[in-house]
Interface confidence: low
Amino acid sequence: EKLPKAPVITTPLETVDALVEEVATFMCAVESYPQPEISWTRNKILIKLFDTRYSIRENGQLLTILSVEDSDDGIYCCTANNGVGGAVESCGALQVKMKPKITRPPINVKIIEGLKAVLPCTTMGNPKPSVSWIKGDSALRENSRIAVLESGSLRIHNVQKEDAGQYRCVAKNSLGTAYSKLVKLEVEVFARILRAPESHNVTFGSFVTLRCTAIGMPVPTISWIENGNAVSSGSIQENVKDRVIDSRLQLFITKPGLYTCIATNKHGEKFSTAKAAATVSIAEWSKSQKESKGYCAQYRGEVCDAVLVKDSLVFFNTSYPDPEEAQELLIHTAWNELKAVSPLCRPAAEALLCNHLFQECSPGVLPTPMPICREYCLAVKELFCAKEWLAMEGKTHRGLYRSGMHFLPVPECSKLPSMHQDPTACTRLPYLDYKKENITTFPSITSSKPSVDIPNLPASTSSFAVSPAYSMT
């Protein structure tokens, strides 16, 4: 008769690599007498004999996972016990491997030049797939504007015309490669003035030609305004080449005037406009000239790059020793404050702050900043940032509020000009125009209806429905 023998595991469990939906087997060879009872655990939880996902054979020595799933990852242990000596245990890991899979592929996007586009590409796989992007036929190279995010999504800051094209993402790991379908990025281009009319100081009865050149997609139309009304006299000559329109207004000067060139183009049902003004003054007329408090220049900073209208002139306040540096520092500080506000409020507040600190500027004889239109300011205050504004107003009075919007250089909406009184006297916030289209997708932010509608005038900067494929935050 055989002598009793305590169990000994002769083949310890090893790490097993398995692909999803494949079979994975652990072998736990045991020598003992009498025959042992062998039990199996996964992550210290007993695997039941009747669990149909497993097959336990060879007197319990062979554990087979019949169709491996992601969730099967873990430490598997076999324990053998026959009542002679102590129970013995051996453990090994199951590493579930998975070919790359694109779980959220990119989608077609229409976006306005200068904004930020995000093409999603969420992937699964083990090892974690690396994600790269192809534009047209060649691999896309990252730069200061274009980045592949940790998530695999492609982010394009300050979208340019040349970014238009067909994109696909590629997920790759040691087990294989997955390609998304081709998607199209279409770039809509706002009307933009390339050459603004120049101001003139002439004698009574002179002829003056004002010239205005604009570009856009589609080609803009140019109209001229004299002191706020359509030009009543003078001849207009137009020339269109490629996507550029050149308009010349010839005038016979009998009185001074402010002449505005308005370039407009249409995208679907929406319009985008760009304006540039020039003054025509009569030399004999004396005019007391106030001293200018600043100058117009192109924005060269980083913080508001994606928010401000591309290539527009902004006002720099010379009451600061170094206006560009000072205003950039202010906005930089302000944006850090905005980290505390809600995702709904933040982009709207950023648009408000950037356009408030860097106001659109009419160079002319006296550089003049164009404040934000009251209606847009109120839209931010009462709709997008209602909670934050209430908290700020309430707590500021009691000296309690020290985060969110408390320290921000926000304008006093009531003191701003209304665009209904003079649409040319104030600046619109394009962000709010196109967010308005999608506002129903945001959570309710006030118990009562806001007292302001987001303005929507045909002359306002182009509006688009927000595509889920790009974000403003």
């Epitope: 690396s130 060649s138 190279r141 990252e142 730069n143």
Partner: antibody, heavy 121, light 112 residues
Framework: EVQLLESGGGLVQPGGSLRLSCAAS????????MSWVRQAPGKGLEWVSA????????YYKESVKGRFTISRDNSKNTLYLQMNSLRAEDTAVYYC??????????????WGQGTLVTVSS | QTVVTQEPSFSVSPGGTVTLTCGLS?????????PDWYQQTPGQAPRTLIY???SRHSGVPDRFSGSILGNKAALTITGAQADDESDYYC????????????FGGGTKLTVL
């Protein structure tokens, strides 16, 4: 004329630290990505680290990750490389190089004369 | 880990044409690696010749040209001159999980 002048090299014991500086002139420093490239005596060029114009991201060769830190001070037109836990294999001439544009991985279009770092006990 | 490969040495007669190549130990070099070429004479800092496959850096003579030949990047020198005797390095932009830039081991060119 673009000029890049490295400094801060020298002899250091294994495990020691050094900080290299690169003073830039002749171009708008804040508009360009920058890199550090090294060359061990008698060996080839080896890219070490890169930083874009904004300084918002940093990139490193795998063997120096966690030991080296690249940074820039755009106001001083200066690029830095802080090297900690130095090893004998870090012995090399370290070149500061300007990228051709704002991005961190454009071509290297201007080079300094290099500063020698010797790691030895 | 992928290694960037170059011929260790090459020789050319004055006035002759030589093509130096730059490959990958696994896979092909494509324009998406944005091959750059650098020249280095002993004791000097490197000098940029070609960037992004085939763009000549300012001040570089048109005797130097870059291209992709098959699965490698190539630097061609036509009408070789004595002062072309140098070390030539290629640099490739690489992205495999993390971005980096890798130089080849260099080719020592001798003008006989």
């Amino acid at each position: 004329e673009v000029q890049l002048l490295e400094s801060g090299g020298g002899l250091v014991q294994p495990g020691g630290s050094l900080r290299l500086s690169c003073a830039a002139s002749g171009f708008t420093f804040s508009d360009y990505g920058m890199s550090w490239v090294r060359q061990a005596p008698g060996k080839g060029l080896e890219w070490v680290s890169a930083i874009p114009w904004s300084g918002g991201s940093t990139y490193y060769k795998e063997s120096v990750k966690g030991r080296f830190t690249i940074s820039r001070d755009n106001s001083k037109n200066t690029l830095y490389l802080q090297m900690n836990s130095l090893r004998a294999e870090d012995t090399a001439v370290y070149y500061c190089a300007k990228r051709s544009g704002r991005i961190a991985f454009g071509a290297l279009d201007a080079w300094g004369q290099g500063t020698l770092v010797t790691v030895s006990s | 880990q992928t290694v960037v490969t170059q011929e260790p040495s090459f020789s050319v007669s004055p006035g002759g044409t030589v093509t130096l190549t730059c490959g990958l130990s696994s896979g092909s070099v494509t324009s998406s690696n944005y091959p750059d070429w650098y020249q280095q004479t002993p004791g000097q800092a490197p000098r940029t010749l070609i960037y992004s496959t085939d763009s000549r850096h300012s001040g570089v003579p048109d005797r130097f040209s870059g291209s992709i030949l098959g699965n490698k990047a190539a630097l061609t020198i036509t009408g070789a001159q004595a002062d072309d005797e140098s070390d030539y390095y290629c640099g490739l932009y690489m992205y495999s999980g993390s971005k980096n830039y890798v130089f080849g081991g260099g080719t020592k060119l001798t003008v006989l």
